[in-house]
């Protein structure tokens, strides 16, 4: 897989930010802001939470999610899974790319029920044109979005 | 915003490291080592804690801070905020770019008074020539800076 | 150190993934999968856990490790150190590049002795041809490998 950087060519990159509409509660991936504030798309496109690859190559993909809660109600999982997943036309199921598991509720104590934690993922993966990358968090109810600086998703060709 | 990589052109990059002088206690941003050891500047400059952009474009900016303490004298509710912020001549206040909140004191236990935690931030942002990026941590006294490998700040054009 | 990106030139990059054989228990660095699944080498080589640089330059190097355990046996260190280290023919000892310390055992609670934590490192360093970068985790017994998506190691030239 020879990949070249030709001069005068724009290098694909994107940074998508968390927004009030990011958490759907539908079991789907997180949704993202693509234009306002710090968000942008350059040489990549977006569809239903997914970064869509236009140009095949190796990409450094990344995501950060801000987690937070008040205590840890029994209805919430004690383990949070944050991952980047690939959707490809060549395969029916999503493929795990980069994943983290955390137990942030250990940060809530009897004298401090409010807790905060952050999960960052980043790594280089090969993506073909038309393939999509999404972010999932289980349990997404613990994701804190606020202003787009605390939870985000991006990529650039390397 | 079309950005090109022309052949024979140096790609701006920098990696700044923590040092004994990093914590000012003045309410300002963290200060950084720019030359010794692993630190360097290439196509970016530095001023009073800030990476200063020479060439406009999209940059992957990152920072890691090593947090630590002995027990939690401030109370377990204490939240640490670690962020990358932009200063621009076009706007009087700093703009949040990438931010994390953590509650590391939940990591101190009866069997282990000493606790350590780490916060990593990274993402792509557009920066104009003359704009500055700084790192802030509240409470900065919980940042370990001594050896330059545990707390650092960097960027490169993508 | 002027570094150029010439057109039609492949940009060195690699992403190595955790495997059952990664944890040697020998006191050496972690070992990695280089070909199967998401793993690849492009313009970099691999030897005994190390990414070996072919072309001198500035590289963004990164590693994530998934940590996990059941409670915190006294035999295990309460502090976990995860680091990227350089081996160079010009110096007999490994050099610390990027390091994190964490106290994940504070995440085990009375209601959930099983805990998970993740450590991510990334930063830009200059590497000469022939120099090697390795990942170490102390205590490596707490690293959870599974399928190559949770613990990994990579780099690309910037």
């Amino acid at each position: 897989l020879i990949q070249e950087r030709r001069s005068h060519e724009v290098n694909p990159a994107a940074h998508l930010t968390g927004a009030n509409s990011s958490l759907t509660g539908s079991g789907g991936p997180l949704l993202w802001e693509t234009q306002l504030g710090l968000a942008f798309l350059r040489g990549l496109s977006y569809h239903d939470g997914a970064l869509v690859v236009t140009k095949a190559g190796y990409y450094y993909i990344y995501s950060k999610v801000q987690l937070g809660g008040v205590g840890c109600p029994l209805g919430l999982a004690s383990t949070i899974t944050h991952g980047l997943y690939k959707r490809t036309p060549r395969y029916p199921e999503e493929l795990e790319l980069l994943v983290s598991q955390q137990s942030p509720c250990g940060r809530a104590t009897s004298s401090s029920r409010v807790w905060w934690d952050s999960s960052f993922l980043g790594g280089v993966v090969h993506l073909e044109a038309g393939e999509k990358v999404v972010v999932r968090v289980l349990d997404e109810r613990l994701v804190r979005l606020r202003d787009g600086t605390r939870s985000y998703f991006g990529a650039f060709m390397v | 915003l079309i950005q090109e990589r022309r052949s024979h052109e140096v790609n701006p990059a920098a990696h700044l490291t923590g040092a004994n002088s990093s914590l000012t206690g003045s309410g300002g941003p963290l200060l950084w080592e720019t030359q010794l050891g692993l630190a360097f500047l290439r196509g970016l400059s530095y001023h009073d804690g800030a990476l200063v952009v020479t060439k406009a474009g999209y940059y992957y900016i990152y920072s890691k801070v090593q947090l630590g303490g002995v027990g939690c004298p401030l109370g377990l509710a204490s939240t640490i905020t670690h962020g990358l912020y932009k200063r621009t001549p076009r706007y009087p206040e700093e703009l949040e770019l990438l931010v994390s909140q953590q509650s590391p004191c939940g990591r101190a236990t009866s069997s282990s008074r000493v606790w350590w935690d780490s916060s990593f931030l990274g993402g792509v942002v557009h920066l104009e020539a003359g704009e500055k990026v700084v790192v802030r941590v509240l409470d900065e006294r919980l940042v370990r800076l001594r050896d330059g490998t545990r707390s650092y700040f960097g960027a490169f054009m993508v | 150190l002027i570094q150029e990106r010439r057109s039609h030139e492949v940009n060195p990059a690699a992403h190595l993934t955790g495997a059952n054989s990664s944890l040697t228990g020998s006191g050496g660095p972690l070992l990695w999968e280089t070909q199967l699944g998401l793993a690849f080498l492009r313009g970099l080589s691999y030897h005994d856990g190390a990414l070996v640089v072919t072309k001198a330059g500035y590289y963004y190097i990164y590693s994530k490790v998934q940590l996990g355990g059941v409670g915190c046996p006294l035999g295990l260190a309460s502090t976990i150190t995860h680091g990227l280290y350089k081996r160079t023919p010009r110096y007999p000892e490994e050099l610390e590049l990027l390091v994190s310390q964490q106290s994940p055992c504070g995440r085990a609670t009375s209601s959930s002795r099983v805990w998970w934590d993740s450590s991510f490192l990334g930063g830009v360093v200059h590497l000469e041809a022939g120099e090697k970068v390795v990942v170490r985790v102390l205590d490596e017994r707490l690293v959870r490998l599974r399928d190559g998506t949770r613990s990994y190691f990579g780099a690309f030239m910037v």
Epitope: - | G69, V70, G71, G75, R113, D139 | L74, S78
Partner: antibody, heavy 121, light 107 residues
Framework: QVQLQESGPGLVKPSGTLSLTCAVS?????????WNWVRQPPGKGLEWIGE???????NYNPSLKSRVTMSVDKAKNQFSLKLNSVTAADTAVYYC??????????????WGQGTTVTVSS | AIQLTQSPSSLSASVGDRVTITCRAS??????LAWFQQKPGKPPKLLIF???DLESGVSSRFSGSGSGTDFTLTISSLQPGDFATYYC?????????FGQGTRLEIK
């Protein structure tokens, strides 16, 4: 620089309460430190009694926990120790000490000169 | 509670000698160990923190090493002012504990 000075009665009757105060000068008690009490019986080693933070969080040695109370007076920039139901075994030099709790520098770096307390009728 | 055992309990040495004192913890304490020097009638003085970090203002003749359960304090070249009692202290776990002390005397 920060200095500590213990004060309190040098003689306490058995079954009574030992009360000591440590005045902090040259710095604020409202910082990221633990304020400790350590004692040393005559001719013996050091024993940690407990610690208090400026926010009033306390941790005590289990061997003394049922008899110890520590508190902070931020207005006066001082902290105190109360040890009740004392016996002759509590006779010792009592030191107050600051322990740094920040990331880069740990350890009990500042100590008072110590005050001798004798338990006797 | 974590027990700290120092050895030797006492030793005699001469000015200029290199001296090593060891401290063993009953369970792992990572690097959360400090060394103190105490002279008669005086409070302890912090020499080393985090097992190997030299406290500001302390002579570089003092050095510490170790991690986990085994630690050492080394005085590279004894000076007359070094004759005192030395204590190790663990601050990893509650309760904080001290070693029993090592008395360093002039030979």
């Amino acid at each position: 620089q920060v200095q500590l000075q213990e004060s309190g009665p040098g003689l306490v009757k058995p079954s009574g309460t030992l009360s000591l105060t440590c005045a902090v000068s040259g710095g604020s008690i409202s910082s990221i430190n633990w304020w400790n009490w350590v004692r040393q019986p005559p001719g013996k080693g050091l024993e940690w009694i407990g610690e208090v933070s400026h926010s009033g969080i306390t941790n005590y040695n289990p061997s003394l926990k049922s008899r110890v109370t520590m508190s902070v007076d931020k207005a006066k920039n001082q902290f105190s120790l109360k040890l009740n139901s004392v016996t002759a075994a509590d006779t010792a030099v009592y030191y107050c000490a600051r322990e740094r709790a920040v990331a880069d520098y740990h350890g009990m770096d500042v100590w008072g000169q110590g005050t001798t307390v004798t338990v006797s009728s | 509670a974590i027990q700290l055992t120092q050895s030797p309990s006492s030793l005699s040495a001469s000015v200029g000698d290199r001296v090593t004192i060891t401290c063993r913890a009953s369970q792992g304490i990572s690097s959360a160990l400090a060394w103190f020097q105490q002279k008669p009638g005086k409070p302890p003085k912090l020499l080393i923190f985090d097992a190997s970090d030299l406290e500001s203002g302390v002579s570089s003749r003092f050095s510490g090493s170790g991690s986990g359960t085994d630690f050492t304090l080394t005085i590279s070249s004894l000076q007359p002012g070094d004759f005192a009692t030395y204590y190790c202290q663990q601050f990893n776990s509650y309760p904080i504990t001290f070693g029993q002390g090592t008395r360093l005397e002039i030979k």
